[in-house]
Amino acid sequence: QEGSLPDITIFPNSSLMISQGTFVTVVCSYSDKHDLYNMVRLEKDGSTFMEKSTEPYKTEDEFEIGPVNETITGHYSCIYSKGITWSERSKTLELKVIKENVIQTPAPGPTSDTSWLKTYSIY
């Protein structure tokens, strides 16, 4: 039950600064152990935010949030479970919702690497 951690990412993944009123999708994934679990939980600041059944034959589980407001700002992580067997928490992703619209300019260079999006915590 140790080993790899679940992963957490966000789409649209151009920024962790989210404009108020928009929608975001948080994606939890657990590529090598997904089939061991039947529930996935999205936590915000250490408490349950959303929870749902996992989908068989998939390794990713999506949570759509929105339209967002400032109360969505916080630290998010994913946990997989089956009964009382819970995975480790994923690393933590910090989301910030801002009031004004953000003008987003594409970053130069390749855009496939989104690892910079993750804000790592102590977990």
Epitope: S81, G83, I84
Partner: antibody
Framework: EVQLVESGGGLVQPGRSLKVSCAAS????????IHWIRQAPTKGLEWVAS????????YFRDSVKGRFTISRDNAKNTLYLQLDSLRSEDTATYYC???????????WGQGVMVTVSS | DIVMTQSPTSMSISVGDRVTMNCKAS??????VDWYQQKTGQSPKLLIS???NRYTGVPDRFTGSGSGTDFTFTINNMQTEDLAVYYC?????????FGGGTKLELK
């Protein structure tokens, strides 16, 4: 044979602290999540806290968040529950439990009584 | 949190009776309901996991059924050693929650 043995209970005044332990044997302790469940006198069962196999992730019921700390020492096969800022409603028998064969609480300790009273 | 409502809270029974108790979840918990037996002065013991699977060594007079929100636990041919409090618990959704218990007493 799987065994879970709790210790460290007693009488404590409101606002004070106590640390209870659970010594495990008969299984590979470091492979399993482990849990604390409590039962107030003449009342039902209530899940309190859980810790993942490595100890990196911990989970608490809302009423004890910020007051209780769960930890484990895999080298000593021991689980701990630190109870701080104790309240009278924390008075209960505290059981450690784990799920080895099923995703349920299939092994329980004998319980340790914690009484919070002035 | 999911609320597990157990009924009845107590039952007066005789040896040899068929005893049935129920547990209702406040929302769908699939088949993730377990049943525990607790005798006076003892720790709880797992009898049934995931609604209907009898735990190792549990006599076949104990059975469980149900899915979704409604679950049933049955003791066929009640024995004196079955006098206890029985609890259901859901583990489908965090946090795990227990029913209030059903106490079996002799008539």
């Amino acid at each position: 044979e799987v065994q879970l043995v709790e210790s460290g209970g007693g009488l404590v005044q409101p606002g004070r602290s106590l640390k209870v332990s659970c010594a495990a044997s008969g299984f590979t302790f470091s492979n399993y999540g482990i849990h604390w469940i409590r039962q107030a006198p003449t009342k039902g069962l209530e899940w309190v806290a859980s810790i993942s196999p490595s100890g990196r992730s911990t989970y608490f019921r809302d009423s004890v968040k910020g007051r209780f700390t769960i930890s484990r020492d895999n080298a000593k096969n021991t689980l701990y529950l630190q109870l701080d800022s104790l309240r009278s409603e924390d008075t209960a028998t505290y059981y450690c439990a784990t799920g080895i064969n099923y995703s349920s609480f299939d092994y329980w300790g004998q319980g340790v009584m914690v009484t919070v009273s002035s | 949190d999911i609320v597990m409502t157990q009924s009845p809270t107590s039952m007066s029974i005789s040896v040899g009776d068929r005893v049935t108790m129920n547990c209702k979840a406040s929302q769908n918990v699939g088949s993730h309901v377990d049943w525990y037996q607790q005798k006076t002065g003892q720790s709880p013991k797992l009898l049934i996991s995931t609604a209907s699977n009898r735990y190792t060594g549990v006599p076949d007079r104990f059975t469980g059924s149900g899915s979704g929100t409604d679950f049933t636990f049955t003791i066929n041919n009640m024995q004196t050693e079955d006098l206890a409090v029985y609890y259901c618990m859901q583990s489908n959704s965090y946090p795990p929650t227990f029913g209030g218990g059903t106490k079996l007493e002799l008539k």
